[in-house]
């Protein structure tokens, strides 16, 4: 029998620096997780102390802090090289800059390779990135080899840039002929590495006849065998056992997010590269585990430029932006507007003919707007005053749901008025009309919804049975200020990019921004 | 069929430099790692030196540590071995071999190319 | 280092006689060990790998066994061609080392 000790991150999302518990910004620091240095030192560890190791990332490290704004992507290439991983998927957030975005800071920096089997580029792109990404990698483990085949989300053109010229094919159809090769050249373990998320990654396991383990991301789904360590609760048993559709016992496995956790599983193989057993448990980072004194010099060495970053100017504002709890937990706030604006903007997708996008709708929580910001400083808005307005370091995400969850959430919004709650919806694309006079709960008189689905873009009743994309923040995706709702009713969840980020870049594009309140949260009394 | 034909072999003076190329044919090049493994006059096999389908992994013999370099282009279905810093002891057949099994087996040999080290 | 020997040196035999050669490992070698042929003149050519595997277009009177030290290549009746060096190898740690090879020779 030969043992392999399987090490791996997914959406570590930008967080280089330890966090907070939430994976927030470190305060306190004898409390703080997680971060590239912390990392280091306990792969170090398993390294010495363990003879075949392979350190493997299953995606989405870019987009998540101002690293990623500052750095974008060079930090990640830098970093992961220092730690040696040994390999990458592909996630639908290294496409968030474009493929340049991802061809020059990363795919041309990493000394790992760089997986995804259903990305294929076509036309002049074709040349260009031939190469800098590959199908599957076979790489030498102690006295054995080990083949790792990538996949990614084939709805990441729905989540970010990837241009034209990168088709991306149903991952389980993609995968087998890789898979199958691998065979053919008598590679006899074979790892599948990507970012589909859990469900996909079940049916990988399930369906692609010869993947012996399944390492994924995307859905941050933590699961743990015994009594967990920290906050979150698991999906399941680490490893998640999946019977596949030939008979054999297949390790699904997946590390939460954000760096938090380094998964860690061990698998033994027989002589014909059958597993026989697996067994693990992600590993917290938490401060008991000292964080590598040269990577952390590193990390303070490369911080500089993010202190310098946060001060310069992005763009100006000529109207007053008020995001103060009086205005945005009562009524229509321009803070709100600007956000969601920036909100949809930054997912701007026009990848059918028949729709002008494929989403318009934006949902934002009042209580999430921390703070104004004042024009009467030149105009001048930093990242510092962002950070300010959005201080939690969450994601402004696209969630599918039904017309009636809508139509809930926004009752919900206005259950308690006038208590300064968070609940109270900011809003992008859609027209509310409350009637306070009504009891809670029956409070919508009006919720017109702005088509996608149409080249001039104009105000429809909101659909009961219908299913609609909508951008919102995490928070609310994961049923915060009480929006229940939404987490049990979703039908579907992708996270997106930092909240700062979205805004920033909005401003940036825009240069001067003028935000106004304009009639799309009214209240009225009387008959409708 | 399975063709590797070596070439570049010939004299050289200790301290000097040599190139060896190796042609391969009749199989999917980039799919394969290989070795140079050569034999002095009289003497039995020795290994000198691996790479990896897709030249991302390299190793090598002690003996020639840090003076030999194998690399490959698979756009031209070529092996490479650079020798610098030659000794008398590098005298040899210089065979070029197709790795069949992750190195569990040495399965195609080309003829060889003698390299004589001599001043 | 790992380093092979092998034994005898030199083996003379008559054709239809049995062969046995001898490979030893200073240390063990798992499965990963080969055997190679060679013909003067000539480049060697694979007979058996993972120590027992017959290698493609190999006759059936080449045998191969052992693990971890011990190895041996059994020729269960020469044939005239058979009469040439032989030389076992091992991998370890992608190093690989030849023995120095036995010579079966014509009695």
């Known amino acids: 029998a030969w043992e392999l000790t399987i090490l791996h991150t997914n959406d570590v999302h930008s967080r280089l620096e330890q966090t907070s518990e939430d994976s927030s910004k470190c305060v306190n620091a004898s409390r703080c997780m997680g971060g590239v240095a912390r990392l280091f030192t306990k792969v170090q560890q398993i390294r010495r102390a363990e003879p075949n190791v392979l350190l493997l990332d299953a995606g989405d490290q870019y987009q998540g802090t101002i690293w990623f704004t500052v750095y974008k992507g060079a930090e990640v290439a830098h970093f992961m090289n220092a730690l040696r991983y040994d390999a990458m998927a592909l996630g639908n957030h290294e496409f968030d800059n474009g493929v340049e975005g991802l061809i020059e800071p990363l795919l041309k920096e990493a000394k790992f390779p760089i997986l995804s089997a259903n990305i294929k580029a076509k036309g002049p792109l074709a040349s260009q990135i031939s190469g800098l990404y590959l199908p599957y990698k076979v790489l030498p483990v102690g006295d054995e080899v080990v083949g790792i085949v990538g996949y990614t989300s084939k709805e990441t053109p729905f989540l970010s840039n990837p241009g034209t010229n990168l088709v991306f094919e149903d991952e389980i159809t993609a995968l087998q002929p890789e898979v199958d090769k691998l065979k053919t050249l008598n590679v006899n373990k074979i790892i599948a590495l990507g970012h589909s998320g859990f469900e996909m990654d079940k049916l990988i396991a399930q369906k692609v006849r010869g993947v012996d383990v399944v390492v994924g991301g995307h859905s941050n789904t933590f699961l743990y065998t015994g009594n967990p360590p920290s906050k979150e609760v698991p999906a399941g048993k680490y490893p998640f056992i999946v019977t596949s559709d030939d008979g054999r016992k297949v390790p699904v496995v997946q590390a939460y997010a954000f760096g938090k956790y380094l998964g860690y599983l061990k698998i033994e193989f027989d002589e014909r590269g059958n597993v026989i057993s697996s067994h693990g448990n992600p590993i917290l980072l938490n401060s008991s585990i000292p964080e590598d004194p040269s990577i952390k010099a590193d990390i303070n060495k490369w911080r500089i430029k993010l202190d310098n970053y946060s001060t310069q100017e992005l763009g100006k504002t000529i109207v007053y932006l008020d995001g103060s709890s009086q205005s945005c937990r009562f009524r229509e706030c321009n803070m709100g507007n600007l956000i969601c604006d920036a909100m949809i903007n930054n997912n701007l997708r026009h990848t059918d003919e028949m729709f002008w996008n494929h989403v318009s709708m934006c949902i934002l929580n009042g209580g999430g707007i921390r703070s104004p910001i004042d024009e009467r400083n030149n105009g001048t808005i930093t990242w510092e005053n962002l950070a300010a307005v959005l201080p939690f370091g969450g994601t402004f995400d696209l969630v599918q749901l039904k017309g009636s969850t809508l139509k809930k959430a926004f009752e919900h919004s206005v259950h308690r008025y006038g208590q300064s709650t968070g609940e109270f919806l900011q809003v992008g694309g859609i027209h509310v009309v409350y009637d306070l006079s009504r009891k809670p709960g029956d409070r919508v008189v009006k919720l017109d919804v702005l088509c996608t689905k149409c080249r001039v873009p104009s105000y429809d009743p909101l659909k009961m049975d219908e299913v609609y994309k909508v951008i919102l923040p995490n928070f609310l995706a994961n049923g915060g200020d009480g929006f229940q709702m939404i987490k049990d009713e979703l039908l579907r969840h992708d996270s997106g990019d930092q909240d700062i980020n979205v805004v920033s870049t909005y401003i940036s594009k825009m240069k001067v921004i003028y935000p106004a309140v304009e009639g799309r949260i009214k209240f009225s009394t009387g008959s409708h | 069929q399975v063709q590797l034909v070596e070439s570049g072999g010939g004299v050289a003076q200790p301290g000097r430099s040599l190139s060896l190329s190796c042609a391969a044919s009749g199989f999917t090049f980039s799919d394969y790692g290989m070795h140079w493994v050569r034999q002095a006059p009289g003497k039995g096999l020795e290994w000198v030196a691996l790479i990896w389908y897709d030249g991302s992994f390299e190793y090598y013999a002690d003996s020639v540590k840090g003076r030999f370099s194998i690399s490959r282009d698979n756009s031209k279905n070529t092996l490479y071995l650079q020798m610098n810093s030659l000794r008398a002891e590098d005298t040899a057949v210089y065979y070029c071999?197709?790795?069949?099994?992750?190195?569990?087996?040495?399965?195609?040999w080309g003829q060889g190319t003698l390299v004589t080290v001599s001043s | 280092k790992i380093v092979m020997t092998q034994s005898p040196a030199t083996l003379s035999l008559s054709p239809g006689e049995r062969a046995t050669l001898s490979c030893r490992a200073s240390q063990s070698v798992s499965r990963y060990l080969a055997w190679y042929q060679q013909k003067p003149g000539q480049a060697p050519r694979l007979l058996i790998y993972?120590?027992?595997n017959r290698a493609t277009g190999i006759p059936a009177r080449f045998s191969g066994s052992g693990s971890g030290t011990d190895f041996t290549l059994t020729i269960s009746s020469l044939e005239p061609e058979d009469f040439a060096v032989y030389y076992c190898?091992?991998?370890?740690?992608?190093?690989?080392?030849f023995g120095p090879g036995t010579k079966v020779d014509i009695k």
């Open positions: 190898q091992q991998r370890s740690n992608w190093i690989f080392t």
């Open positions: 993972d120590a027992s």
């Open positions: 071999v197709r790795d069949g099994q992750w190195g569990s087996r040495l399965d195609y």
